[in-house]
Interface confidence: low
Amino acid sequence: GQNITARIGEPLMLSCKGAPKKPTQKLEWKLNTGRTEAWKVLSPQGDPWDSVARILPNGSLLLPAIGIVDEGTFRCRATNRLGKEVKSNYRVRVYQIPGKPEIVNPASELTANVPNKVGTCVSEGSYPAGTLSWHLDGKPLIPDGKGTVVKEETRRHPETGLFTLRSELTVTPAQGGTTPTYSCSFSLGLPRRRPLNTAPIQPRVREPLPPEGIQLLVEPEGGTVAPGGTVTLTCAISAQPPPQIHWIKDGTPLPLAPSPVLLLPEVGHEDEGIYSCVATHPSHGPQESPPVNIRVTETGDEGQAAGSVDGSGLGTLAL
């Protein structure tokens, strides 16, 4: 049999070898596709089948607009003028090229020596599903589950049957390397079909804090507290000599004397926000801790609030 690949929505014509120039009863097509239950028989004398397929005068079978449900096996049996039976057998597969893939939520900056999300590559409208692959500086990036992690997701549209692919890349860049260039490509895996490439992204690699990096500890854990409760933030840093520690809320310095501990007693909603501490060390200037989101909630439900918090003041602050 012959393998045929056809693009969804386009016409497909299958020729019937040995078909007589003026067909009589001596030609028939048998189809086993997603539209048929087992085999469907079509003959030149029969009606066109649901506008899906019809036999042309030369015996060829025409499908005016092929779809996913037309994938399957097509067989023609014809008797030539000499009375010899000639069979044609086709295995038909369909494809659809998706739109150009793109990297959504691309990182503009990566921190060396820690896992960072580079971005999510998205391809929409393919058939068959195909594959997404990542490239670093033009070379294929092989996920190893450690320094390079790829999370993939494939969804199929319930009506069109076309696929959406998502591939999230997380990397742990080395320190002191060059600026990496990441790109992603989609491949249908069909012969003579070139991969589709995204525009490249070039996040800069930020050096991590020195070994004596800052840790921000929060009590209660998770940073969610009931109104009237107490929150204790502790800025832990192993540097010697100990640096001055200042406190930041929503990007603004809190006017307090430097201290490694920030105590928020009897908290109210005005105390909610994103807190971090800044250590000023003679050898490498100010270093900021990762942020902690403090939430004041009646029910004590856990969870992170997203986005910026515009501070409009603090309640009582004690050190």
Partner: antibody, heavy 117, light 109 residues
Framework: EIQLQQTGPELVKPGASVKISCKAS????????MLWVKQSHGKSLEWIGN????????FYNLKFKGKATLTVDKSSSTAYMQLNSLTSEDSAVYYC??????????WGAGTTVTVSS | QAVVTQESALTTSPGETVTLTCRSS?????????ANWVQEKPDHLFTGLIG???NRSPGVPARFSGSLIGDKAALTITGAQTEDEAIYFC?????????FGGGTKLTVL
């Protein structure tokens, strides 16, 4: 050399909006907070708000909440301030300044905004 | 909102020591107000001099120093020079906002 380069003067109509940019160079943009300040003609300075480029978190003077919106584009090391629903009261020189939490060492040259019909 | 008050103008001579002060309407200025001092020269040229009461900004000459004198923040210029003629603004952090003073016009004759 550390520099904050601000956009040139803007002449805008009442009710319109304007977006001022402040492009940082010569230092790591995400390591410092960006402060925005207003200087009205013949008056002192007024603090508008801060943005932390590393996290994108903002903090506003309540007087300017709703009037000013602060954003950053880390890829181009640029801070932006959009002023909405402009009136003649908003005619002023607007400055960005780099802050490392306890001093504002480097300032932009200022952007003059004139609101006039 | 707090009001921050400065001397409107001061005059000094080259080589002299001059002190500019900054008062808060809410009471004594403390280290918790993180007093800042900013210099404005003609054509809107601003430079940060002092932050956190007494931290000199990088590159600022040693003749500029910040301190607390009594209940006020102070900027002292030891051995003033003609190029120090400018307007000096102080700024104080309060719990949720930053307030600038009206500025002191310093003349060096």
């Amino acid at each position: 050399e550390i520099q904050l380069q601000q956009t040139g003067p803007e002449l805008v109509k009442p009710g319109a909006s304007v977006k001022i940019s402040c492009k940082a160079s010569g230092y790591s943009f995400t390591d410092y907070i960006m402060l925005w300040v207003k200087q009205s003609h013949g008056k002192s300075l007024e603090w508008i708000g801060n943005i932390n480029p590393y996290y994108g978190s903002t903090f506003y003077n309540l007087k300017f909440k709703g009037k000013a919106t602060l954003t950053v584009d880390k890829s181009s090391s640029t801070a932006y301030m959009q002023l909405n629903s402009l009136t003649s009261e908003d005619s002023a020189v607007y400055y960005c300044a780099r802050s490392d939490y306890w001093y504002f060492d480097v300032w932009g040259a200022g952007t003059t905004v004139t609101v006039s019909s | 909102q707090a009001v921050v008050t400065q001397e409107s103008a001061l005059t000094t001579s080259p080589g002299e020591t001059v002190t500019l002060t900054c008062r808060s309407s809410t009471g004594a200025v403390t280290t918790s107000n993180y007093a800042n001092w900013v210099q404005e020269k003609p054509d809107h040229l601003f430079t940060g001099l002092i932050g956190g009461t007494n931290n000199r900004s990088p590159g600022v000459p040693a003749r500029f120093s910040g301190s607390l004198i009594g209940d006020k923040a102070a900027l002292t210029i030891t051995g003033a020079q003609t190029e120090d003629e400018a307007i000096y603004f102080c700024a104080l952090w309060y719990s949720n906002h930053l307030v600038f003073g009206g500025g002191t016009k310093l003349t060096v004759l």
